[in-house]
Amino acid sequence: HSFGPGPGLGTPRSPCNARGPCRLFFRVCLKPGVSQEATESLCALGAALSTSVPVYTEHPGESAAALPLPDGLVRVPFRDAWPGTFSLVIETWREQLGEHAGGPAWNLLARVVGRRRLAAGGPWARDVQRTGTWELHFSYRARCEPPAVGAACARLCRSRSAPSRCGPGLRPCTPFPDECEAPSVCRPGCSPEHGYCEEPDECRCLEGWTGPLCTVPVSTSSCLNSRVPGPASTGCLLPGPGPCDGNPCANGGSCSETSGSFECACPRGFYGLRCEVSGVTCADGPCFNGGLCVGGEDPDSAYVCHCPPGFQGSNCEKRVDRCSLQPCQNGGLCLDLGHALRCRCRAGFAGPRCEHDLDDCAGRACANGGTCVEGGGSRRCSCALGFGGRDCRERADPCASRPCAHGGRCYAHFSGLVCACAPGYMGVRCEFAVRPDGADAVPAAPRGLRQADPQRFLHHHHHHHH
C-alpha cells in the first residue's frame, strides 16, 4: 500500500511543502452504487478517517518516492445489509505540521472515485487508482460483524447451545461450523446461500440467482460480455483474462473492450486514457463556503479557490478556528465575525482585547487630591478631607462626622479639618488625655490654632480603610 507519484510523470512535488513536515490522512467514503459520484452527495453507506499516520519530512526538490502507508486499517461501519455494489471514494488529505507552518493547515491532495462490486466475506481486493500526478495503491474487503453472515450480511448466526448439533429446525450456519442459524425472518424456504432479506417474509436474491426463493441460477443468456455459465453455485464465469479485468479505468470510469484492447468512459471531471487526469473546472463549483474560484476555465488549466475569511484548504473546505489563539484577555469571549475577530468583555473590562481593567487604578484619577485604592476586585477613591463621592468630585463637610474626640471643637480648614481640644486632651483628633501629673504635658497652643501636621494626617488617612 502506498501513495506517491504515478509512473512516467517526472519528479513530482513532495506531498509536503517548504513549510516543514506533514502527515497524510485518508478519508474513505462509501456511497450506494446507484448514487451520483458528486462531491456533495452523502456517504450514505458510511465514512471513516484513517488514524496513526506517519510523519513525512520530504521537502521540495527531493524526489518524492512512493510513501509507505500505515498498516492500520480504515474501518468503515455500514448499516443494514451490504449492498454488494457501491461507490468507493478515497480522499488523501495533507496536514501541515510545525509551529511555523502558517497558511492552510489542511489540503485535499487527491480524490479517487470508483464503482465496485464486492461480496461480504470474500478475500482482499487490490486496486490502483490514479488522479493527477498521484497514484494510490490499496486493498479493500467487506466483512460482516457477528452475528451477521452471508454475502449481504443479512443472515444471523448464534452460538450453538450444544457442541455437536443445532436446535430443532435450525441448521449449522456456514461458514461458521460452531454456530447455528438464528430463527429465520425471511420467507420460508428462502435460500440461505443465495437469498437474504431486510424485511420479514421477503426473499431477495444475490447476483446470479433468481426465483421466489432464490434457488434458480440465472440462465446462460444473462451472462454478459462473453462470460459463460458456471456451476450452479457460481453463476457466471469469465472464459479467461480480458483487457477490462481489474478495471483499468480510474476515478469511476467504466471499461469496455474494443478489439483486444479497452476504452474508458470517464465520469464528468476526469479525462485521459484511464480517466486518470482530473478535469475539474470552476464550472464544477469546487470551492466551498463561498470561496471564489479563479482559473480553470477548461479541463487543462488548474483552478484556485480564494477563501473567504475564516476558511482555508485547497477547496475552502476547512473552517479556521481563529479564536483558538485565545486573543481575548480577562475571560472575554472571542467572536469570529468573519471580517474580523472581536472580544466581548466581561463586566469590568474593556478594550479591543479586554485588556483594560475598569476596576483598577490604571488611568483612573481621583479628583481633588484623592487616592485610588484597589482591593476585592474593584477600585475606589479614598478622598482628601473635604471631598467625597465616587471620584472625589463632591465637596464634603469634614466636620460632619464629628471627628474631634472628648468634646473637641471641629473647624473646617483649607487642608482639611482642625480640632480644638478641650482642656486635658491633645492630639490630631484630641484622642490623647494629658497625664494628670503633667509629666507629658505639652505647652498649650494659642486657642483654636492647634493644627494637625498635614503630612502625618494625610499619611494616616491613606492607610485608613473605610
Epitope: 469571549l333 469570529d336 465575525l337 468573519g338 466581548r344 466581561r346 463586566a347
Partner: antibody, heavy 121, light 107 residues
Amino acid sequence: QLQLQESGPGLVKPSETLSLTCTVSGGSISSSSYYWGWIRQPPGKGLEWIGSIYYSGNIYHNPSLKSRVSISVDTSKNQFSLRLSSVTAADTAVYYCAREIIVGATHFDYWGQGTLVTVSS
Amino acid sequence: AIQMTQSPSSLSASVGDRVTITCRASQGIRNDLGWYQQKPGKAPELLIYAASSLQSGVPSRFSGSGSGTDFTLTISSLQPEDFATYYCLQDYNYPLTFGPGTKVDIK
C-alpha cells in the same frame, strides 16, 4: 427546524432553588458556533439576560444576580440547565432559553416559548 | 454595565404609518445591537442583528440603522401584525442588556 423547550416546576418557595432545563431538538448543542442562554421577564416588565453557556462548559452570567446563578450543560442529552438559589418574589418571571450565534454576527436567533415560574409560599 | 434607553416608551400608530423607535447606549457599542419583537404571551423574535442586518424571514419593511451609541428601528409601513413591544439588546459586552421596550399599539 431547531426547537428549544423549557421545563421545570412552575412554583418555587422563597429561599429555595429554582431549577429549569432547556432541551434542544433539531440541532446539536455541541456546535462551536453557539452559546446557549437564559433570559427572564417579570410579569409586565422588560427582558433581563441571566447568563449563557458554551457546550464545553464556559459560562458568562449577569453580575446583578451575583453568585445565585448556576448554569450547566449536558451534551449527551442535548440539554442545558439553570439553577437560581435563594429565590424571592422578585424572581417571579417567565424564563426563556435561547440560542445565541457567536460566529459571523451575534444575536439570539431561536427562543423557547418560555415557562412561568412563580415564587410564593 | 451598559445601560440601554429606548424612546418612546409607547406609541400609538395606524396601519400604514411609518414608525421609528430609537435606542441609545450609555457608551459606544459599535454596531453590536439587535432588535426583537415580542407579542403578548409569546417569546421575543429577532428582527434585526448587527444594527442593520435583517434576519431571514423578517419582512423588508423592518430596517435598522445606527452605530456607536444611537440606533434606530424603522417600520416603513405598519401592518396589523406589527402591533407589539420592541426591545433593543446590546451584545457588545457582558452583561448583555436590553432596552426597557417600546410598546406599539393601535391608534
